[in-house]
């Protein structure tokens, strides 16, 4: 679907609406008629929509997970798939839609016990360099036949964050995915809460570093929903601001 393609980026890796990639303020993209992609640029055209390839759930939108499109298919070819709703089968938490988590192979609501809400930030927003998944779900790599002997530095091409050196993550920049610095305290980040909210992200930012989570900056609480500024902030012991 169109949404699957457009929403296939890391939750924290966003096009800079503030302070990032200057020179690309909402320029029109000559792609599908009548659609303006936030963060797009006039030099890009999408001739045909294709599934967004991925290696990690974090590369997909909040309402997606990364997996092989066919049951028993080639695990080396994975794309972002729509998340699974309540009572659907699952193998790991990321397969379940926001507000649910995977319990005994079934997506169940996390409303009763704030499980998903409380671990969401620590797993998807500040897992630092630990890119393991909760259910030990393994993935076959699809690296180039030229094996990389060293971890990618800033500006190195990558397929997944584990290709990058410590302190870096794998994020999209135009037609490639490259190693970029993980965000530090106080740096701007953006949290995508709704499907379709982040459009076609051609400039992705990394997630917040270890011990940090992406939250609304205190002095921006009064701002309108669309212009809330999120920054990487230190964890607090009590989180009561999760919205599902």
């Amino acid at each position: 679907t169109l949404n699957s393609v457009l929403n296939s980026n890391a939750i924290k890796n966003l096009p800079p609406p503030l302070g990032g990639a200057a020179g690309h303020p909402g320029s029109a993209v000559s792609a599908a008629p009548g659609i303006l992609y936030p963060g797009g640029n006039k030099y890009q055209t999408i001739d045909n929509y294709q599934p967004y390839p991925c290696a990690e759930d974090e590369e997909c939108g909040t309402d997606e997970y990364c997996a092989s499109p066919t049951r028993g298919g080639d695990a080396g070819v994975q794309i972002c798939l729509a998340c699974r709703k309540r009572r659907k089968r699952c193998m790991r938490h990321a397969m379940c839609c926001p507000g649910n988590y995977c319990k005994n192979g079934i997506c169940v609501s996390s409303d009763q016990n704030h499980f998903r809400g409380e671990i969401e930030e620590t797993i998807t927003e500040s897992f630092g360099n630990d890119h393991s998944t909760l259910d030990g779900y393994s993935r076959r790599t699809t690296l180039s036949s030229k094996m990389y002997h060293t971890k990618g530095q800033e500006g190195s091409v990558c397929l997944r964050s584990s290709d990058c050196a410590s302190g870096l993550c794998c994020a999209r920049h135009f037609w490639s995915k490259i190693c970029k610095p993980v965000l530090k305290e106080g740096q701007v980040c953006t949290k995508h809460r709704r499907k379709g909210s982040h459009g076609l992200e051609i400039f992705q930012r990394c997630y917040c570093g270890e011990g940090l989570s992406c939250r609304i900056q205190k002095d921006h609480h009064q701002a309108s929903n669309s212009s809330r500024l999120h920054t990487c902030q230190r964890h607090h012991h009590h989180h009561h601001h999760h919205h599902h």
């Epitope: 990639a21 640029n41 030099y43 055209t45 699809t142 036949s145 500006g155 091409v157 037609w175 490639s176």
Partner: antibody, heavy 117, light 111 residues
Framework: EVQLVESGGGLVQPGGSLRLSCAAS????????ISWVRQAPGKGLEWVAS???????YYPDSVKGRFTISRDNAKNSLYLQMNSLRAEDTAVYYC???????????WGQGTTVTVSS | EIVLTQSPATLSLSPGERATLSCRAS??????????INWYQQKPGQAPRLLIY???KQGSGIPARFSGSGSGTDFTLTISSLEPEDFAVYYC?????????FGGGTKVEIK
């Protein structure tokens, strides 16, 4: 060993069409972005088009609407369909990939396109 | 688009000398903590070869005598001691924004 081999260049009249090909080997072709860059005789380098691993495409204004970049991952091949050719399109056309670094780090040997009547 | 201006257009030096090539961008090419500037070497009849990416990082198999520095709008490629095979044309390129643009080149020739 990473290899990129261009073909399809030649002499064509203004207004004519040409299709360039680039055969890639030595890496997982489908995973990486690949581009066309050209160099007019005695001039500098000019980016022509790029296609990502997820198949979105990018062009400069100078070729937009006339050139189309495409890739066939099953054949490890990149293409550049050039229509409505002009004299100023005369150049050596290189395919280049961003395999290790966010740069054009591997290049083919180039294929020459001459647009003249 | 971002315009890159290279200077000098020609640099006449002898083997063993130090070469300093400049590349100035019309606006900052830094973003996400990275300088999106690359340097290439091209010899007559050959394809360009990547020397430096992300402002200062060496490409694969590039000799240590080639180094890149700078940030924002001003960048420098330094060849610490010219070897006979280093006489060529050098291009800088920005990849911060589409369209990617190249500088006009600096020709390093034998004095």
């Amino acid at each position: 060993e990473v290899q990129l081999v261009e073909s399809g260049g030649g002499l064509v009249q203004p207004g004519g069409s040409l299709r360039l090909s680039c055969a890639a080997s030595g890496f997982t072709f489908s995973s990486y972005a690949i581009s066309w860059v050209r160099q007019a005789p005695g001039k500098g380098l000019e980016w022509v088009a790029s296609v990502s691993g997820w198949l979105d495409t990018y062009y400069p204004d100078s070729v937009k609407g006339r050139f189309t970049i495409s890739r066939d991952n099953a054949k490890n091949s990149l293409y550049l369909q050039m229509n409505s050719l002009r004299a100023e399109d005369t150049a050596v056309y290189y395919c280049a990939t961003s395999l290790e670094n966010y740069a054009f780090d591997y290049w083919g040997q180039g294929t020459t396109v001459t647009v003249s009547s | 688009e971002i315009v890159l201006t290279q200077s000098p257009a020609t640099l006449s030096l002898s083997p063993g000398e130090r070469a300093t090539l400049s590349c100035r961008a019309s606006e900052s090419v830094d973003d996400f903590g990275i300088s999106f500037i690359n340097w290439y070497q091209q010899k007559p009849g050959q394809a360009p070869r990547l020397l430096i990416y992300a402002g200062s990082k060496q490409g694969s198999g590039i000799p240590a005598r080639f180094s890149g520095s700078g940030s924002g709008t001003d960048f420098t490629l330094t060849i610490s001691s010219l070897e006979p095979e280093d006489f060529a044309v050098y291009y800088c390129q920005q990849l911060k924004e589409v369209p990617p643009t190249f500088g006009g080149g600096t020709k390093v020739e034998i004095k």
